[in-house]
């Protein structure tokens, strides 16, 4: 990897628990500032792959509230407006680090977690084997 | 939002830090066991939005490497597997927490921060304006 | 034309299990889509279960937990696992086929169905 010089001003770190324990603020910096706000906001509904989306909310989570993706049909939508079954909405996924309070109910002490998200889906050709 | 009993074995927190700062454990818990392990990986060549993959690295943040998706085409592939332009292949974007090392070059000092990363493109209809 | 012949139907008790397969005629590339559906008397056709080629699956509601569907893609299979089986169950199950391909990459539109395996759940 590679080697960070290391900050004299840095916080000290017990040996016992450094580099698996750190101090986290959790004072948000949104590095999103000049993203268009629309976004993705209507897409699940445009896409020829739609989805609906699921809001999946846990307390002992940080962020406690992750919207989740489920494609609404197992085909796509084609040019009449009709579900095609040559096709597949399939889910686009992504792994998302959030944390977890460890031990549990504790305000100010948490674990790394990695977590397997659906954002929103695609429409994809199946594998198809083409013989000359 | 919702309140949840401290446990009493709960490491303390200093009031002039507290909520700002907290430990995390590193030691990252993986909760994607049962996930299908061939997911989504080769749904970017396959859709009828296809994308490319780019390697963004930032060693001042955890984790330092993210993959972000940039669409192929501005419109979507068809049938014939041309692109036809009366559709839009869009990214699929979604804010994410990463940790920034603050101050800088501190191996075990971190603050949150949300980036919005595109995790896929998804083909959608273009917003047409009917006129009466 | 494709065709699909479905066996594994019959008497079984209530909480019992069946297993239903549904084959099709092999002289195509792909069906990216196999179902079941159920038709009890007097009701109209039902959807039970769905899988895509890429192994995304529906369900009714009312089946989730209970039936699993699977898939034999290369041999062109689709299977239901019926557990825990309830008198309401009991319906005459047929297999649906579409979004087939064949060998030249090319789309049949046709939506075929089985002749249909009965089912019965009763004590």
């Known amino acids: 990897g590679i080697t960070i010089p290391r900050n004299p001003g840095c916080p000290n770190s017990e040996d016992k628990n450094f580099p698996r324990t750190v101090m986290v603020n959790l004072n948000i910096h949104n590095r999103n500032t000049n993203t268009n706000p629309k976004r993705s906001s209507d897409y699940y509904n445009r896409s020829t792959s739609p989805w609906n989306l699921h809001r999946n909310e846990d307390p002992e989570r940080y962020p406690s509230v992750i919207w989740e993706a489920k494609c609404r049909h197992l085909g796509c939508i084609n040019a009449d407006g009709n579900v095609d079954y040559h096709m597949n909405s399939v889910p686009i996924q992504q792994e998302i680090l959030v944390l977890r309070r460890e031990p549990p109910h504790c305000p100010n002490s948490f674990r790394l977690e990695k977590i397997l998200v659906s954002v929103g889906c695609t429409c994809v050709t199946p594998i198809v084997h083409h013989v000359a | 939002g919702i309140t949840i009993p401290r446990n009493p074995g709960c490491p303390n927190s200093e009031d002039k830090n507290f909520p700002r700062t907290v430990m995390v454990n590193l030691n990252i818990h993986n909760r994607n066991t049962n996930t299908n392990p061939k997911r989504s990986s080769d749904y970017y060549n396959r859709s009828t939005s296809p994308w490319n993959l780019h390697r963004n690295e930032d060693p001042e943040r955890y984790p330092s490497v993210i993959w972000e998706a940039k669409c192929r085409h501005l419109g979507c592939i068809n049938a014939d597997g041309n692109v036809d332009y009366h559709m839009n292949s869009v990214p699929i974007q979604q804010e994410i927490l990463v940790l920034r090392r603050e101050p800088p070059h501190c191996p075990n000092s971190f603050r949150l921060e949300k980036i919005l990363v595109s995790v896929g493109c998804t083909c959608v209809t273009p917003i047409v304006h009917h006129v009466a | 034309e494709v065709q699909l012949v479905e066996s594994g139907g019959g008497l079984v008790q209530p909480g019992g299990s069946l297993r239903l397969s549904c084959a099709a005629s092999?002289?195509?590339?792909?069906?990216?889509?196999m179902a079941w559906y159920r038709q009890a008397p007097g009701n109209q056709r039902e959807l039970v279960a769905a899988m895509t080629s890429d192994a995304t699956t529906e369900y009714a509601d009312s089946v989730k937990g209970r039936f699993t569907i699977s898939r034999d893609i290369p041999e062109n299979t689709v299977y239901l696992q019926m557990n825990s089986l309830k008198p309401e169950d009991t319906a005459v199950y047929y297999c649906n086929a579409k979004g087939i391909w064949d060998y030249l990459g090319r789309r049949d539109f046709g939506d075929y169905w089985g002749q249909g395996t009965q089912v019965t759940v009763s004590s």
């Open positions: 092999r002289n195509i590339n792909i069906i990216n889509y």
